[in-house]
């Protein structure tokens, strides 16, 4: 094949090599960019910046090598359009630093930075951590900080991510109230901060105020849906990112729902209760307080992380006709109380029969479809032992 005269020449089925001295000053309009998986660039002293727009359209790129070139700056978002990138070699350039954001979101198996005049500061704490943790082949490079010494020796005690404190109201918050949250950000080299409110949806009207180091957030006309929803404050500096989430408790009265009893392993009278603070519960049976036992007890399902409603069952272990009746669930919190009732019939009363009717005496056969090994009771077939005391 004839030698390729262009600045960049195909290499294999999906590679490109750009090695002609000084031919590139940016990576715009590379031929066949959308299918490239490998890009090798060398001896490009005019290629000094790598930015978001340079790698747009290189979505399939896996290996990027820019060596012995003039690269001075790599933008924090430079690799946003190359999420599959797994090998990045930027050795022997003029890089003094590289932001943690540049590699965030990538799954780099290899990151080569040797031969750059790196300047040690907290901005390279993430790289020092990679070296400590043996990531990306960094330890083998024995990276040096220009004028100082091995990156491994850089003191890092003061290299922390921002510290966040979110102040929430102490007093109880009612539906319709306005709530002011304040996020206090401390730390060195603060760059950006803000709120993440994705969970809030229609829970309140949101108004942001202020900026670093004190961010304000007003949640106006709050609804009970705001409960259990995360309001997150975040901040970034040259070391990394910190997030703190808080929840605002919006008080609202207890409510309760009961559903028809269902037979599972035990019988279950399903219920749902809601309220903030969480209501206390009490069961009544035929109007009297029902004392729970190991045979009749309340059991809650695992609560959903982002809602106040609790679902559960009144569990009845092998209830008989004596358990038939009216079940009432009372729920109360400081803002109100609610109740719901339901009739439950677990078993017919065996003593309510016509003396003329024959008394069944046979056992039911075991139901072969049953998932448990216990005999399955069937109405009108179930045998009852009748003992008569004689004395």
């Amino acid at each position: 094949a004839a030698p390729c005269p262009d600045a960049c020449c195909p290499h294999g089925s999906s590679g490109l090599r750009c090695t002609r001295d000084g031919a590139l000053d940016s990576l715009h309009h590379l031929p066949g960019a959308e299918n490239l998986t490998e890009l090798y660039i060398e001896n490009q002293q005019h290629l000094q910046h790598l930015e978001l727009r340079d790698l747009r359209g290189l979505g399939e790129l896996r290996n990027l090598t820019i060596v012995k070139s003039g690269l001075r700056f790599v933008a924090p978002d430079a690799f946003h359009f190359t999420p599959r990138l797994s090998r990045l070699n930027l050795s022997f350039n003029a890089l003094e630093s590289l932001s943690w954001k540049t590699v965030q979101g990538l799954s780099l198996q290899e990151l080569v930075l040797s031969g750059n005049p790196l300047h040690c500061s907290c901005a390279l704490r993430w790289l020092q951590r990679w070296e400590e943790e043996g990531l990306g082949g960094v330890p083998e490079q024995k990276l040096q900080c220009h004028g100082q010494g091995p990156l491994a020796h850089m003191p890092n005690a003061s290299c922390g991510v921002p510290t966040l404190k979110v102040q929430v109201p102490n007093a109880s918050v009612d539906v319709g109230d306005d709530v002011l949250l304040r996020c206090q950000v401390e730390g060195r080299g603060l760059e950006q901060a803000g709120w993440i409110l994705t969970e809030l949806e229609q829970s309140a009207t949101v108004m942001k105020s202020g900026g670093l180091p004190s961010l304000g957030l007003t949640l106006a006309n709050v609804t009970s849906d705001l409960n259990r929803k995360n309001v997150t404050c975040w901040a970034e500096n040259d070391v990394g990112r910190a997030e703190v989430s808080v929840q605002v408790n919006v008080s609202f009265p207890a409510s309760v729902q009961l559903h028809t009893a269902v037979e599972m392993h035990h019988w279950c009278i399903p219920f749902s209760v809601d309220g903030q603070p969480a209501p206390s519960l009490r069961w009544l049976f035929n109007g009297s307080v029902l004392n729970e036992t190991s045979f009749i007890f309340t059991e809650f399902l695992e609560p959903a992380a982002n809602e106040t409603v609790r679902h559960g069952c009144l569990r009845l272990n092998q209830p008989t006709h004596v358990n038939n009746g009216n079940y009432t669930l009372l729920a109360a919190n400081p803002f109100g109380q609610a109740s719901a009732s339901i009739m439950a019939a677990f078993m017919d009363n065996p003593f309510e029969f016509n003396p003329e009717d024959p008394i069944p005496v046979s056992f039911s056969p075991v139901d072969t479809n049953s998932t448990s090994g216990d005999p399955v009771e069937k109405k009108d077939e179930t045998p009852f032992g009748v003992s008569v005391a004689v004395g």
Partner: antibody, heavy 119, light 106 residues
Framework: QVQLVQSGAEVKKPGASVKVSCKAS????????MHWVRQAPGQGLEWIGT????????SFAQKFQGRVTLTRDTSTSTAYMELSSLRSEDTAVYYC????????????WGQGTTVTVSS | DIQMTQSPSSLSASVGDRVTITCRAS?????LYWFQQKPGKAPKPLIY???SLGSGVPSRFSGSGSGTDYTLTISSLQPEDFATYYC?????????FGGGTKVEIK
């Protein structure tokens, strides 16, 4: 113990060059960056540049770019700083100092070399 | 470059006095270094990494601070402490020095 011994005072004419030496002893010369700092009479300290004797990597303050050359001789554990196109404002005491990476600071300084630029 | 501003530029004090010198960086830094220099001598390292004492430095010297504001304190000034003190940063390239604070006998 660790020592940096510098060459003697120099008097130069404007436009000339001066080469100051800094001989290191008591440690592995090639392992630590050597920096050069100067101090004009009655003034503060001003950083000039640095060299890594292990591989001759070097860098300089913008102000001295193109006028300063940093070299080293590993066989004698000596670092050199050459400043060309001298002007009267280059009159100063020139110091070499080692950057000690274990504790991350300039821990040992040479005694200084006075360079006077005068016509 | 990060600018280092020392204050005061000079001060007069007596033996036994408590002396505080401040150094402010034009942007946040991780660590600060302090040097003592006597006339005709090379700078001598006093404090490294903000608060660690250099070898052979008496405990009356102490350093503190974070972000952009740092201080050097001499708890009880001794005759040998009359000198010029410089702060220096190497958080960010290039290393830069403060303008110096001359401590003179009152």
């Amino acid at each position: 113990q660790v020592q940096l011994v510098q060459s003697g005072a120099e008097v130069k004419k404007p436009g000339a060059s001066v080469k100051v030496s800094c001989k290191a002893s008591g440690y592995t010369f090639t392992e630590y960056w050597m920096h050069w700092v100067r101090q004009a009479p009655g003034q503060g300290l001003e950083w000039i540049g640095t060299i890594y004797p292990g591989n001759s990597d070097s860098s300089f303050a913008q102000k001295f770019q193109g006028r300063v050359t940093l070299t080293r001789d590993t066989s004698t554990s000596t670092a050199y700083m050459e400043l060309s196109s001298l002007r009267s404002e280059d009159t100063a005491v020139y110091y070499c100092t080692r950057f000690y990476y274990e504790d991350w600071y300039f821990d040992v300084w040479g005694q200084g070399t006075t360079v006077t630029v005068s016509s | 470059d990060i600018q280092m501003t020392q204050s005061p530029s000079s001060l007069s004090a007596s033996v036994g006095d408590r002396v505080t010198i401040t150094c402010r960086a034009s942007s946040s830094i991780s660590y600060l270094y302090w040097f003592q220099q006597k006339p005709g001598k090379a700078p001598k390292p006093l404090i490294y990494r903000t608060s660690s004492l250099g070898s052979g430095v008496p405990s009356r010297f102490s350093g503190s601070g974070s972000g952009t504001d740092y201080t050097l304190t001499i708890s009880s000034l001794q005759p040998e402490d009359f000198a010029t003190y410089y702060c220096q940063q190497y958080h960010s390239y290039p290393p830069t020095f403060g303008g110096g604070t001359k401590v003179e006998i009152k």
